[in-house]
């Protein structure tokens, strides 16, 4: 028996359902009574879901997993993982035993898009050219950790005097705060780009300083 899984990681958005694909080629005359199927976490071997003795033994993992019972006899051993969480990320092994055995691992990559950044300025009044200002770009509830880029109005990257911090909340999602300290010119636009490296999703925020008033 040969077990096949997708070589590319499965990317799943937080709170959505994901399917970890696994298949095998049944021999002629195969019946489900002959099948033993185990899904387990690759690193710890923690049991996730099992099928044995002709019966789905159910989820051993937060009661959020399911097989596709009608497709098992055709060799479809895929696992459905519901309401994906950050903590579900990792490698899952599909182990199939009939008169022979084989196993293969599939990676689950969890992702969550970042919110549109909000921009704040300090100080935010009586601004004059030559003043040092602090611009903060904040984006929320994303995963995994973001990449943050700053540019000026001409699209020139701003890399000096940038401090970025990322904090995970209780669900494992990140809030990102990036602070740019810059000396004001006569006027200017400062933009912040928050990129989710897995989703290749870019969230943009900008602030334009033209004396008074400020535009965000």
């Amino acid at each position: 028996v040969e077990v096949q899984v997708s070589e590319d990681p499965v990317v799943a958005l937080v709170d959505t359902d994901a399917t970890l694909r696994c298949s095998f080629s049944p021999e002629p005359g195969f019946s489900l009574a002959q099948l033993n199927l185990i899904w387990q976490l690759t690193d710890t071997k923690q049991l996730v879901h099992s099928f044995t003795e002709g019966r789905d033994q159910g989820s051993a993992y937060s009661n959020r997993t399911a097989l596709f019972p009608d497709l098992l006899v055709q060799g479809n051993a895929s696992l459905r993982l519901q309401r994906v969480r950050v903590t579900d990320e990792g490698s899952y092994t599909c182990f199939v035993s009939i008169q022979d055995f084989d196993s293969a691992a599939v990676s689950l990559q969890v992702a969550a898009p970042y919110s549109k950044p909000s921009m704040t300025l300090e100080p935010n009044k009586d601004l004059r050219p030559g003043n040092m200002v602090t611009i903060t770009c904040s984006s929320y509830q994303g995963y995994p950790e973001a990449e943050v880029f700053w540019k000026d109005g001409q699209g020139v990257p701003l890399t000096g005097n940038v401090t970025t911090s990322q904090m995970a909340n209780e669900r494992g999602l990140f809030d990102v705060h990036s602070v740019l300290r810059v000396v004001l010119g006569a006027n200017g636009t400062y933009s912040c780009l928050v990129r989710n490296p897995v989703l290749q999703q870019d969230a943009h925020g900008s602030v334009t300083i033209t004396g008074q008033p400020l535009t965000f």
Epitope: L47, T52, S97, D102
Partner: antibody
Framework: EVQLLESGGGLVEPGGSLRLSCAAS????????MHWVRQAPGKGLDWVAV????????YYADSVKGRFTISRDNSKSTLYLQMNSLRAEDTAVYYC???????????WGQGTTVTVSS | QSVLTQPPSASGTPGQRVTISCSGS????????VNWYQQLPGTAPKLLIY???QRPSGVPDRFSGSKSGTSASLAISGLQSEDEADYYC???????????FGGGTKLTVL
Amino acid sequence: EVQLLESGGGLVEPGGSLRLSCAASGFSFSSYGMHWVRQAPGKGLDWVAVINGEGSGTYYADSVKGRFTISRDNSKSTLYLQMNSLRAEDTAVYYCTKYYYNYAMDVWGQGTTVTVSS
Amino acid sequence: QSVLTQPPSASGTPGQRVTISCSGSRTDIGTTSVNWYQQLPGTAPKLLIYQSHQRPSGVPDRFSGSKSGTSASLAISGLQSEDEADYYCASWDASQNTWVFGGGTKLTVL
């Protein structure tokens, strides 16, 4: 008739090596996983290792991991167990067995005796 | 020390019914099938029960197996003198990816 015939056992000193063979007949050898199971004198059965039909997957008991290697030659319908760094506690009758549904072992050889002693 | 627990011995008189127990855990018997082997004196083991309750062809229906939770049992009814042997339960341990045997039960027919 399905048959398994082990060979290669014998007396070996501690730290020595031995290679066991198991010749299979009467079934499509490459379609089945195969095990080695041992039994020390007067003791119970002790699982040693397993290999899948195409030889790409293996598992070992902790007690032999890193010292024993299970392999197979499907063109010769033969299973092997290479045993290195042998210890006195490896003394046993070694059986090769055929993989069966639901993790069972449905055919057993007659066994070959390995004695590790100085 | 065996991962699966069996009584070291059991006995019965001819015609009697004898039961041998096998206790495991959630990751072996609780997750997968139990198989039973009979080893007559001086011979190789023989598969007696697979998939917890199935008999291979040639095994008399006096032998039956059952499983509940993390325990299993082998029942032999109408005990005969030729049933005197060692009996082993076995399973696959999903937490270790290894096969595990019970310590064996020596059955004596009185």
